[in-house]
Structures are given as structure tokens and as C-alpha cells.
Interface confidence: low
Amino acid sequence: EEELQIIQPDKSVSVAAGESAILHCTITSLFPVGPIQWFRGAGPARVLIYNQRQGPFPRVTTVSETTKRENMDFSISISNITPADAGTYYCIKFRKGSPDTEFKSGAGTELSVRAKPS
């Protein structure tokens, strides 16, 4: 089986306040089995943004059709962006377990928030 890679192609994304931000993430293998999660920030203080196994996450929608069995696109859209949403977002693959354990992280995408156009 191909070794899993997590590709976050955008190093940074800039979005105007009030708009939606699309954060891209694709994976290259279905294995190991386990959910994808998105976090803002790293380390103990990181904030969970999206978890494939939990929810709902009212401001977050998946960009692709995640019901496709071989889906490898876990890009997300975050609506109604505010300055508080600024930060680096990591797409992380977890390995199934009790509990699920972190397997591999993408390189991160930095989200900056511009002032709302007047």
C-alpha cells in the first residue's frame, strides 16, 4: 500500500471578514483506516475545527462529496470568517483506535483575515 501523504497545497489563504474560507487538503491513501480532523493551531492549545467522526460543526462544510467511498479530498469551507479565525490550520489523519491516535499531519495553511470591504 502507498504511504499516506497529506497535502495542504496552500501555505496561506487570505479572506475578507464575513466571507467563507476554503482550506484545501487531500490525502494519497485510504490507509490506515481512521478519520480526518482539522485543527487551528498546534500543541495542547489547538482548537478542533472539524472531525469526520463527530459533529455537527455548524460553520464547517466539506467541499467534496465525502460519501464517495474512495474520497481523498477533505477540504473544508468555513463560513462567516471573523478575525478570531486567523491562524494556521492543520489537516490531520488519525488512526482508528480506542481512542483514535494522530497518524500524520499536513504542513498547515495560514489563514489571515482582511477587514470587511466597506
Epitope: 490507509f31 483506516v33 466539506t62 462529496e65 460519501t67 464517495k68 467511498r69 474512495e70 488512526r95 482508528k96
Partner: antibody
Framework: DVQLVESGGAVVRPGESLRLSCKAS????????MSWVRQAPGEGLEWVSG????????YYADSVKGRFTISRDNSESTLYLQMNSLRAEDTAVYYC??????????????WGLGTLVTVSS | ALTQPASVSANLGGTVKITCSGG??????????YGWYQQKSPGSAPVILI????KRPSDIPSRFSGSTSGSTTTLTITGVQAEDEAVYFC??????????FGAGTTLTVL
Amino acid sequence: DVQLVESGGAVVRPGESLRLSCKASGFTFTNFAMSWVRQAPGEGLEWVSGISGSDDTTYYADSVKGRFTISRDNSESTLYLQMNSLRAEDTAVYYCVKDSTVSWNTFFDYWGLGTLVTVSS
Amino acid sequence: ALTQPASVSANLGGTVKITCSGGYGSDDGSSSYYGWYQQKSPGSAPVILIYWDDKRPSDIPSRFSGSTSGSTTTLTITGVQAEDEAVYFCGTYDTSSGAIFGAGTTLTVL
């Protein structure tokens, strides 16, 4: 409320064809993969075929590959199963099922009431 | 194929556990997620009780719970009710075979 209503079940002879339909409502049809699951009399559940929501990628159980064709009409929110070269062992209640949004680890969160297909000479 | 007992029984108000094993494994030691379905009578529409091993839909009573260890998953019903008498199917997704189900376990409430 999510509703899945199957139709098209009938009594047919071996070798004949049949087309099942499933009318869906209560959810955005294009956002979800759909499948057919069958249950032979007194038996368990058997997944038959599935189709993804937007790009029509299809999947089949080995037992029906080459004989059955799954398709969907997103404009009509309708799922189809074209069954050719029917055999006695295809006799079953056929359920139309909606896939959940749990990526490729698929679970079926809504089921229709089923339609009975009987293949007998 | 998934393996589960053909039948189990439980006292009204008691606890019953139904096991299911045989989901696929991969070279890295990971395994498939399981779900559980309830069918009240033959030919009636099954209802999903548990998905992702242990997640319960919001409309399913909390007496139903799921847990998984290795390639064995367990459905636990705590405080069994008369209306829980039904056939319970475990299910999973195999990347080569598509969705697969166990043969079903009939629960009798005494």
C-alpha cells in the same frame, strides 16, 4: 423527513429483466451516495450495489457484477437498479438505502420499506 | 464475512451484549469501523443504531451502545425493553467487497 420509496418489484422468470426505482425526498439527493441492499426470505442483509452522489461512480457485489446496473437521476431524485439475467437466487426484498456522510466507511442511515422481487419458473 | 451469534436472550430490564467479528484488517494493523442495525420483523426496514463503532444517532435511545476491540465489535443494550426484541445485524465496509453484514442475531426478551 427523509423518505425512500421503492417500486418495480414483481414476479419474473429466470433470465428475464426488471428495473427497480427509488424515489427519494427530504434531503439533498446529489449530496449523498445511494445503495441497494437485498434480503432473501429468511436470510440476512446483502449489499448489492452503490453509486456516488455527484460523479456516478458505481460499485457492485460480485454476485451481481455484469448483470445489474445501478444509476441515478439527480434531477428527479430517483435511484434505479436495472436487473438482467435474473436468477432464482436473486429473489429478495430490495431496499433502497441512503449512505451516511462517513466517507468510504459507509453506513446506511435511512432505508426504504423495500420492494419484493421473486424469480421463479 | 462477519460472524455473530444466531440468537441471544435477555431478561426484561437486564443487559445483553451481542458480539460481531471478522472485519477486514490491513498491513498496518488498522481495522474497519462497524455499525449496527435493528430489524423488528423480517422484511421490515432496518434502522441504524450505531455507526463508527460507537456513535449513536440522536434519535436512538441511550440504552444502545457500541464498542470495539481489535476486530470484534459489541452492541450492548442496557435495560432491555420488550420492544427491543428484534434481529440485530452488524455491518462494516470492506474496500474490496463493499458493504458487508453479519448474518443477524435474534434477541428474545424473557
